[in-house]
Interface confidence: low
Amino acid sequence: MEDFNMESDSFEDFWKGEDLSNYSYSSTLPPFLLDAAPCEPESLEINKYFVVIIYALVFLLSLLGNSLVMLVILYSRVGRSVTDVYLLNLALADLLFALTLPIWAASKVNGWIFGTFLCKVVSLLKEVNFYSGILLLACISVDRYLAIVHATRTLTQKRYLVKFICLSIWGLSLLLALPVLLFRRTVYSSNVSPACYEDMGNNTANWRMLLRILPQSFGFIVPLLIMLFCYGFTLRTLFKAHMGQKHRAMRVIFAVVLIFLLCWLPYNLVLLADTLMRTQVIQETCERRNHIDRALDATEILGILHSCLNPLIYAFIGQKFRHGLLKILAIHGLISKDSLPKDSRPSFVGSSSGHTSTTL
């Protein structure tokens, strides 16, 4: 059997519905049909059960961890800082996303058997989680920047403003995730499991490029630059002023940001490489195509893993979270009140002192 690869748009259009009279029947096959074997997506059957186990673990950890985080923040009404409000929203986003993981896990094994409605909803939750996550972290970085570099409590004092910012973040995340809601559907293919996939008609490739570049720019690169700017100046101020306590107070936030970057930067870099390849900036080969597909699968797992990591950061680095959790357990008589630390305060990760709101 001879195999040929076809990449020409005009020839593809012809097969998809153009009139045969436009073509010369005696002409030879286009050269691009003769020089390469078809580029088949590599089957990753071996990995799918490993992925399901990862998804199941992340689901359980995320459900437990983020529920506890939300519980602790909601309990500590008195000393709740601005950062706490952002972290509460972050936990909510992760929790909502975690609830979709069993569906994603099942789809890895059986293909997308849940229909178009769930395809749209579940994909939307995944996208909203990602965008709200990075936008909330950008807001935390701005809050830390204002509190430490400019020693201002403007945002801290205006609670309604924080609520408005959080609502705006959710709104903007929904907006950035809108393409998924509009164009995702269940795609049925013969001999292949159905997939939850973008379907934009004949201009699928062009639309997808535009609808990928826009969210990638506004939803990842812009917030990333804001974070780098804010934390750059915040660190400089802390080191210059030798503010030891406040430096310690930044550990949780830096850990949260670092973990976010470690989890989502690889995926976005691979996505960027794929974008460049599809726009012919990088030359496309079958090997590269399969490498990028494999890298997308692998780095996506990292991104999914992120939804359960923030609670672990608070538990291991955030002293106030541990104290808050112990306090809740003591209130409900699950542990003795004597075991509570003496300096245990109601705030989850923060306490306001002077003109700054420090986060632990």
Epitope: D3, N5, N191, L271, D274
Partner: nanobody
Framework: EVKLVESGGGLVQAGGSLRLSCALS????????MGWYRQVSGQQRELVAV???????DIADSVKGRFTISRDNGKNTVYLQMDSLKPEDTAVYYC?????????????????WGQGTQVTVSS
């Protein structure tokens, strides 16, 4: 592995009929079109007929009214019914399929060809 298996070729008298069939198997994704090309040794390959996923078909002018193309979507099979055969229809007939596979963000557009089946029309 994706395979295209043709059958039905052979030797036939002028004015006679033959039915070629071609079955596509393997991990193929969705089939956008299946069709037939033919090639006389030493000459260029020419398109005979195409059947697209939407149900539309097209036949080359040289065989119009004599050849018909049909498809069994359930079996991923395409047929070429050749009636009123002429000696000039003698050629190797190649089955062709254009498919799309989905993976991540990408649509893989692939083309597959059969080994070819010899059709000889004697006068």
């Amino acid at each position: 592995e994706v395979k295209l298996v043709e059958s039905g070729g052979g030797l036939v008298q002028a004015g006679g009929s033959l039915r070629l069939s071609c079955a596509l198997s393997g991990r193929i994704g969705s089939i956008n079109a299946m069709g037939w090309y033919r090639q006389v040794s030493g000459q260029q390959r020419e398109l005979v007929a195409v059947s697209r996923s939407g149900g539309s078909t097209d036949i080359a002018d040289s065989v119009k009214g004599r050849f018909t193309i049909s498809r069994d979507n359930g079996k991923n099979t395409v047929y070429l019914q050749m009636d009123s055969l002429k000696p000039e229809d003698t050629a190797v007939y190649y089955c062709y399929a254009h498919t799309s596979s989905y993976s991540n963000w990408r649509v893989y557009n692939n083309d597959y060809w059969g080994q070819g089946t010899q059709v000889t029309v004697s006068s």
